[in-house]
Interface confidence: medium
């Protein structure tokens, strides 16, 4: 039977190699049943994830999944780093795995890592039963 837990389908150690100056959309695939949860993005600073308050975000709804998108218009060199999306659902916090952006300055584009180098690990999508309160370690 279908689970009605909120699920955040972010790749475990997923990575994106992107160019500064380009537009980019970072997607957080969100699966929910009835009420869409409140979702936010944050950027990791050491062990702390700093909420991104004043950034353009949007929802894209598809048949079986929704995407909460963080827009980079354009990508800036200091956008380099790891990001995480979080969902508030029935007073519980559900956190995704982090996804890392490797931003290459256009001037040094020839030094960009290849796609193969970026694909460091397989997928693991992160699920939490909504009745389990979760503190990410």
């Amino acid at each position: 039977k279908e689970s009605c837990d909120v699920q955040l389908y972010i790749k475990r150690q997923s990575e994106h190699s992107i160019l500064a100056g380009d537009p980019f959309e970072l997607e957080c695939p969100v699966k929910y049943c009835a009420n869409r949860p409140h979702v936010t993005w944050c950027k990791l600073n050491g062990t702390t994830c700093v909420k991104l308050e004043d950034r353009q975000t949007s929802w894209k709804e598809e048949k079986n999944i929704s995407f909460f998108i963080l827009h980079f218009e354009p990508v800036l060199p200091n956008d380099n780093g790891s990001y995480r999306c979080s969902a508030n659902f029935q007073s519980n916090l559900i956190e995704s795995h982090s996804t890392t952006l490797y931003v290459t300055d256009v001037k040094s584009a020839s030094e960009r890592p290849s796609k193969d180098e970026m694909a460091s690990r397989p997928w693991l999508l992160y699920r939490h039963h909504h009745h389990h309160h979760h503190h990410h370690h």
């Epitope: 475990r12 079986n64 795995h97 693991l124 999508l125």
Partner: antibody, heavy 121, light 112 residues
Framework: QITLKESGPTLVKPTQTLTLTCTFS??????????VSWIRQPPGKALEWLAH???????RFNPSLKSRLTITKDTSKNQVVLTMTNMDPVDTATYYC?????????????WGQGTLVTVSS | DVVMTQSPLSLPVTLGQPASISCKST???????????LNWLQQRPGQSPRRLIY???KLDSGVPDRFSGSGSGTDFTLKISRVEAEDVGVYYC?????????FGQGTKVEIK
């Protein structure tokens, strides 16, 4: 009921390309989080993971064989196809496909019966 | 790559007696999500592998409770409390925490 079944040639010549098909039922690769792996086992030896494909066509390969491997899926046919180029006698093995879902609780929970591929001239 | 080392490689056992297989990894298998992706598989003679245990200690449905898994970090153990004839075969550990996924070299369990 979940089943997987491998099919392909039993004998290939050195330097040829091997194409294997995994036909499965009881789950769909169009379902979010679903995936299928290929694993091989040379006669009398241990298992070796080769490649994995996910519902969204994301692919992962064993780096030691990546340059020789291709993995594709046909969601409508419930099939995953593995191709391995430049076959060598050391590639003689039983090739298995197995299911691997996103939550870690279904990594390799269902396996096919395997198909023995012999590489010989 | 993470190397999975099993011991012993051959394990002659007496029916009804316990058996234990060790699996050691060259890196910790504790993932950032708090889970440890360590499975045990059984391969009976002439058959395809069958998963017995996942996430270190969770038994697959249909697996007799004489099988148990334990361990953490880099050291893991599969135990059979009382070996039965149908337990003969090769047992593999597998890790899915680090890419590429890797298997142990196998432990052959046979009856004395």
């Amino acid at each position: 009921q979940i089943t997987l079944k491998e099919s392909g040639p039993t004998l290939v010549k050195p330097t040829q390309t091997l194409t294997l098909t995994c036909t499965f039922s009881g789950f769909s690769l169009s379902t979010f989080g679903m995936g299928v792996s290929w694993i091989r086992q040379p006669p009398g030896k241990a298992l070796e993971w080769l490649a994995h494909i996910y519902w969204d066509d994301d692919k992962r390969f064993n780096p030691s064989l990546k340059s020789r491997l291709t993995i594709t899926k046909d969601t409508s046919k419930n099939q995953v196809v593995l191709t391995m180029t430049n076959m060598d006698p050391v590639d003689t093995a039983t090739y298995y496909c197995a299911r691997g879902n996103w939550d870690g609780e279904t990594y390799f929970d269902y396996w096919g019966q395997g198909t023995l591929v012999t590489v010989s001239s | 790559d993470v190397v999975m080392t099993q011991s012993p490689l051959s394990l002659p056992v007496t029916l009804g007696q316990p058996a234990s297989i060790s699996c050691k990894s060259t890196q910790s298998l504790l993932d950032s999500d708090g889970k440890t992706y360590l499975n045990w598989l059984q391969q009976r003679p002439g058959q395809s592998p069958r998963r017995l245990i996942y996430l270190v200690s969770k038994l697959d449905s249909g697996v007799p409770d004489r099988f148990s898994g334990s361990g953490s970090g880099t050291d893991f153990t599969l135990k059979i409390s009382r070996v039965e004839a149908e337990d003969v075969g090769v047992y593999y550990c597998w890790q899915g925490t680090h890419f590429p996924w890797t298997f142990g070299q196998g432990t052959k369990v046979e009856i004395k």
